[in-house]
């Protein structure tokens, strides 16, 4: 009965001043809750940016993000014999970003379809739970990798069965913390209909009352306490690696862990300036214009950022490479299409070679680990 | 003043072609979704063709979905509606109408004078 | 499509008097309903929308309600000025569609 002809193609949480709340009186009859959707939001909501840019980064992030991650996560439980703390956090990032990145498809054929959601109120909620989820895990499973890189270099001899005890437990408390903070997004009505471009929106046009102060609470607070805090003691720890790193020894061996080392936080910190930074501040920003200007001016920021937030999950393979010599060998090995034990075995004399010359203290192979730079 | 003027009404026989114009003015024209609506002789209103402000959407009822066509030219501050394949049935006042989206849905806050099409042979 | 029926036909009405017109949506429209006025030979003027938001310009004697599929529209101390017919019509689901008309008279 309606025909929607998109020629040009032209969301989180739409720039609207909300007219009324939802609530359930003492009768027990819910009153209808109001929103506003205005021309803006409505040419941002058909606009390219939504219908296009996005799909786009988001197919990018699940093409490069699904088999990476999938392959880490494999790598991890099954082809690294020791679970040192390192192993385990990566481990956990790979899961949350996997997490995230298998609802992707569903994200993909929303925005093609010009923000038409079709799936349902709970897997809308899902898909947010989870979208939010992976960013604050990635977070703190980066800053628990970062510290416990540090704590290597100054602390190399340690108890690896209670290292690995104690990142297990850090981790589960971190996966506890972040379903807490994620309940309000599971809670929240996440879908609304909107009328005059006969869409069903997840989570661009919010309804409640809520989305002017307590929106606007919930993400200051989740900008500082889990990502300003996290960032600070990221930046703390690489700070105190370097000035180490710096005063060592000079062998070869010394060097190549540096170096790797280097790349490492060149890799977090990109992790931090795309993706962890501009979302977190966009999000407060964002909200904070709505309740007090009844309008977001920097929408249009506040969805780029968003969207790039997800590229945590291309870049975090990057991270493993760098800390993981298994994964390395993996990763290596899947792209040029080989297999770990033919290459193993045609290695098997030159590795002998180069173990009888060097120290093995730092070599991170799946035999003798003891830091994995 | 916010002012809509039609125009491009007529006598046109049954299967023939008319293309009618908005000419908008006192208000920013690419801001505004704007909308066709008819009104048979001694009958009600019926709603014909919208356009988002972008010109990027259009939306229709069946009745004339692939033979009426609503487009938009911002440099001219100009809507239009080409009309195909006219049938009797489409004898009416046609008018146009500035549109405001309120809670997410479409409200017809200004209307032009109308401009009659007579389909006849 | 919604169908949208009003009554009555049509109505008189003495000055300073109040009436009233409904209008039934096919199905729950969820607040999404507009009033329009229609003076003769003239282009019609929205009055309310989304049931019971008055348009700038509009008088106060106006006001609309309901919820669901059962609207009505108020016009408290009828004025000559008042006189013409009346539309509602739903902002819903596409195609938008209005109702047959209430005709207004002064007594």
């Known amino acids: 009965t309606i025909q929607g002809t998109n020629r040009s193609s032209k969301g989180r949480s739409l720039i609207g001043k909300v007219d009324g709340t939802s609530h359930v009186t003492g009768k027990g009859v819910t009153v209808e809750t109001v929103f506003s959707v205005d021309e803006f939001s409505a040419s941002v909501l058909t606009g390219k940016l939504t219908t296009v840019f996005l799909p786009i980064v988001y197919t990018i992030v699940f093409v490069v993000g699904l088999p990476s991650n999938g392959m880490a996560l494999w790598v991890f439980l099954f082809r690294t014999k020791k679970k040192h703390p390192a192993v385990i956090y990566m481990a956990n990032l790979a899961l949350a970003d996997l997490l995230s990145v298998i609802w992707f498809p569903l994200k993909i054929a929303y925005h093609i379809h010009g923000n038409n959601w079709i799936y349902g109120e709970a897997l809308c909620n899902v898909l947010i739970g989870f979208f939010y989820g992976n960013m604050y895990c990635s977070i703190l499973f980066m800053t628990c990798l970062s510290v416990q890189r540090y704590w290597v270099i100054v602390n190399p001899m340690g108890h690896s069965r209670k290292k690995a005890n104690i990142a297990i437990g850090i981790s589960l408390a971190i996966w506890l913390l972040i379903l807490l903070v994620t309940i309000p997004l599971y809670v929240v009505k996440q879908t609304i209909f909107i009328p005059a471009l006969n869409i069903t929106t997840c989570h661009d046009v919010l309804p409640e009352q809520l989305l002017v102060g307590d929106m606007f609470n919930y993400f200051l607070s989740l900008a500082i306490g889990v990502f300003l805090f996290p960032a600070f003691l990221t930046a703390s720890a690489y700070v105190l690696m370097i000035r180490m790193l710096r005063s060592s020894a000079m062998d070869e061996n010394s060097e190549k862990k540096r170096k790797r080392a280097i790349k490492l936080i060149v890799t977090v910190l990109a992790m931090y300036l795309i993706c962890f930074t501009p979302s977190n501040l966009l999000l407060v920003v964002h909200y904070f214009l709505i309740k007090s200007q009844g309008q977001s001016h920097v929408y249009a920021l506040y969805i780029v950022a968003l969207c790039l937030s997800t590229l945590n999950s291309c870049i975090d393979p990057f991270v493993y490479y760098f800390v993981s010599h298994d994964f390395r060998d993996h990763a290596k090995n899947a792209l040029l299409c080989r297999s770990v034990r033919t290459v193993k075995q045609m290695q098997v004399s030159l590795t002998s070679k180069k173990h009888s010359r060097k120290s093995s203290s730092y070599s991170s192979s799946s035999t003798t680990v003891k830091t994995s730079y | 003043e916010v002012q809509l003027v039609e125009s491009g009404g007529g006598l046109v026989q049954p299967g023939r072609s008319l293309k009618l114009s908005c000419v908008a003015s006192?208000?920013?024209?690419?801001?505004?979704?704007m909308t066709w609506i008819r009104q048979a002789p001694g009958k009600g209103l019926e709603w014909v063709a919208s356009i988002t402000n972008s010109g990027g959407r259009t939306y229709y009822p069946d009745s004339v979905k692939g033979r009426f066509t609503v487009s938009r030219d911002s440099a001219k501050s100009t809507l239009y509606l080409q009309m195909n394949s006219l049938r009797s049935e489409d004898t009416a006042t046609y008018y146009c109408?500035?549109?405001?989206?309120?809670?997410?849905?479409?409200?017809?806050?200004?209307w032009g004078q109308g401009t009659l099409v007579t389909v006849s042979s | 499509d919604i169908q949208m029926t009003q009554s009555p036909h049509s109505l008189s009405a003495s000055l300073g008097e109040t009436v009233s017109i409904e209008c039934l949506a096919s199905e729950g429209i969820s607040n999404y309903l507009a009033w329009f006025q229609q003076k003769p030979g003239k282009s019609p003027q929205l009055l309310i929308y989304?049931?019971?938001s008055l348009q700038d310009g509009v008088p106060s004697r106006f006001s609309g309600s309901g919820s669901g599929t059962q609207y009505s529209l108020k016009i408290s101390n009828m004025q000559p000025e008042d006189e013409g017919v009346y539309y509602c019509?739903?902002?819903?689901?596409?195609?938008?569609?209005f109702g047959g008309g209430t005709e207004l008279e002064l007594k």
């Open positions: 109408t500035r549109d405001r989206i309120i809670r997410g849905s479409t409200w017809f806050t200004y």
């Open positions: 989304y049931a019971s």
């Open positions: 006192g208000f920013t024209f690419n801001n505004y979704w």
């Open positions: 019509q739903q902002g819903y689901k596409y195609p938008w569609t």
